[in-house]
Each structure stands twice: as C-alpha cells, then as structure tokens.
Amino acid sequence: EPPTACREKQYLINSQCCSLCQPGQKLVSDCTEFTETECLPCGESEFLDTWNRETHCHQHKYCDPNLGLRVQQKGTSETDTICTCEEGWHCTSEACESCVLHRSCSPGFGVKQIATGVSDTICEPCPVGFFSNVSSAFEKCHPWTSCETKDLVVQQAGTNKTDVVCGPQDRLR
C-alpha cells in the first residue's frame, strides 16, 4: 500500500517517499522505485538553506554600495549573504535592505543615544560642566577637565563647546 506520509527529510511524490536534497543542493530528479533522489550543488553566488525539493537555488543577496550597504558575511551554498551599512549610516530595517545617514550632533551637543540598526542618532545639549567640540554621531558630551586634581587653576572657563584651560598656580615670591 502506498504511503500517505513520509519521514522527516523526505517528500511524497508518485505515491513514493523520496529523500529531500540537503541544504546547499537543488533537486535534479525525483527518486523512483529504482533510483535515489538526484541533487546538484548550488552554483557560485547561489544558496538553499533548508532540506528541499527546489529545482532552482536562490541568488545571494547583493549589498548595493549605492544604498550604503556592504557585505558583513559572504554567503555560502547554504546561507544567504548578510548586508550591513557603511560606517556613518544605519539600516532602515532589521533585514537591512538599505541605509540612511546617521545624524551628527553639532559642537555643543553630545550623543544621547547612538543610532541603532533601525533608529537615528539622538542628540542632547551639553549641560554646564560638559562640552563637545566636534560634530559627531558617536561622541557624548565630555566633562570639563578638573584643573584642581592636576594641581592647576582655571585660566579660561569652559563652555558647552570648549574645555576649560588649566594653568599653573601663581607662586608667592
């Protein structure tokens, strides 16, 4: 009596259980009463990531540099290529199909939250006692240098964009 269901890694065809092709291989011909399933490895830049009966392998994803993308992990016959964004950009989705430019925080502002895979940079003004002298998508506000701990005195006050300038203490003659 012909089977109605097959074991794992098999499929039913013509009232017969045939072996699926392993990941990285595609189906060339179904098994018969006398022959095994015939499978063939995927070509260069192709993959199949499951036990399958596909007659065509999938093309590896293309990480388009014009969209700010680069290859993070090159695909194999069993896995797709993984794209990520170039430095200074972030993915527009978890799948990272395209990138957008990180917002930079201007001098006087620091990064409150660095851009994540799916959200842009969040900036905050540097409070009193802190400064940022660069336009950056990474740098937080830095605390002013403590002149006292270096046995120096403040010669020039700091701002939200500049550090304090320390100098030697006046010596009594």
């Epitope: 290859v71 993070q72 992990q73 660095i114």
Partner: antibody, heavy 116, light 112 residues
Framework: QSVKESEGGLFKPTDTLTLTCTVS????????MIWVRQAPGNGLEWIGV???????YYATWAKSRSTITRNTNLNTVTLKMTSLTAADTATYFC???????????WGPGTLVTVSS | DIVMTQTPASVSAAVGGTVTIKCQAS??????LAWHQQKPGQPPKLLIY???TLASGVPSRFKGSGSRTEYTLTISDLECADAATYYC??????????????FGGGTEVVVK
C-alpha cells in the same frame, strides 16, 4: 576607534563574572561584537558574538552559562558568565568582530583570576 | 560544531625565508575568515580578513588565500619581528550551526 574592557580581578569559584566593554569612535550598530578569552599559555578561545539585531551565538562550552548583551545608549557590550571555576582564569578580550569587508578592533584585555 | 583545525602547531624558518600556515574549517565558511598575529602580553593584531584582504598597515609579505574549507596564510621574506603566534578565525555564523571555537589552535612562528 577603540574598544576597552572593564577591570577583571579576583573571583571565587561559583561566583558570577560580569565584564563590560565600552566602544568609542564607531557605531556598533553596524558591527558584530565578540568576547574571547585566553588562559595563561594557551590559545584564543571564542566565547560568543552579538550582532546588530541582538542575535547571539555562543561556543558550545559557554552556552549554558554565558550571556552577551548590548546597550546602544551607553555604547557597551556586557558578558555575564555564571558558575566560575579555576578553569575560567584567563585574560578576557572584547573586540569588534572582523567581518568580510571590515577589520576588527581588539581591546587590551582584562585578567580574571578564579581562586578560592 | 564548526571546528577550525590549524597546522602546524609550530614552525621555524630563517630570516628571509617563507612559512605557510594552513587552516581547515569543518564546514564551508565561504571566505569569512581572518588571520591574527599575537605577541606575548599583547592583544591579537588583525592581519587579513575576508580570507585574502590585507588589513590596514600590514605589509604585503603577508598573503591569505583559500576558499570554502581550506585556507592558507603565507609569510614571505621573514623578518625577526614576524616571530609570534598566528591564529585563523572563522567569522561565519549561522543559526543552523554550532561552534566550539571560531579560532584555530594557533601556530608559533620561530624566526632563526
């Protein structure tokens, strides 16, 4: 661009180790971060990796007692390892993982000693 | 488990000579491979990524080659400064795979 691990130190057997790695000069949302350790006189031993979507992969020996997390606000990656034994004595490194098109960045490492 | 097997464990060669280090992955890692150099008391230093791309500042005496499961690091015109331990590292991660150690066991290069 730099990566730096928090201070290690002396731990007792059964203690839990928590190490924090702080990155600066790059957005780690585009990179994978790894933890690696090296016992005295031994080779490099990979512990695990976290990717930009917070997916984690662990070495089979580390899976049951290691957790790697990221905090994008603080720009940090944390390794938590439970049930320490003397065999966990090593220098622990955090690194921005090398990938197919970009080089990695290693931290200087921090020494963790487990002894009763 | 994906296992990285590195050979030889140690190799010795004269200044000006050539050494070849091999790394075998237990499955196809698709050129997602790096080579690192480590000297005592220092963190590793990246030499090569993507199986054959030279990292910034690394001299062209270092050459990476190979594909799929077999990879090679060749150091030519050996210098005394090349004395170090060299490690291969798989940068290939897949939900369907597990990993014992993504690093090879290391090769100590002695320069005579």
């Amino acid at each position: 661009q730099s990566v730096k691990e928090s201070e290690g130190g002396l731990f007792k057997p059964t203690d839990t180790l928590t190490l924090t790695c702080t990155v600066s000069g790059f957005s780690f949302s585009n990179y994978r971060m790894i933890w690696v350790r090296q016992a005295p006189g031994n080779g490099l031993e990979w512990i695990g990796v976290i990717d930009r979507n917070d997916n984690t992969y662990y070495a089979t020996w580390a899976k049951s007692r290691s957790t790697i997390t990221r905090n994008t606000n603080l720009n940090t990656v944390t390794l938590k390892m439970t049930s320490l034994t003397a065999a966990d004595t090593a220098t622990y490194f955090c690194a921005r993982d090398t990938d197919y098109t970009t080089g990695g960045i290693w931290g200087p490492g921090t020494l963790v000693t487990v002894s009763s | 488990d994906i296992v990285m097997t590195q050979t030889p464990a140690s190799v010795s060669a004269a200044v000006g000579g050539t050494v070849t280090i091999k790394c075998q992955a237990s499955q196809n890692i698709g050129d997602n491979l790096a080579w690192h150099q480590q000297k005592p008391g220092q963190p590793p230093k990246l030499l090569i990524y993507g199986a054959s791309t030279l990292a910034s500042g690394v001299p062209s005496r270092f050459k990476g080659s190979g594909s799929r499961t077999e990879y090679t690091l060749t150091i030519s015109d050996l210098e005394c400064a090349d004395a170090a331990t060299y490690y291969c590292q798989s940068n290939y991660y897949s939900t369907s795979s597990s990993y014992y150690n993504s690093f090879g066991g290391g090769t100590e290069v002695v320069v005579k």
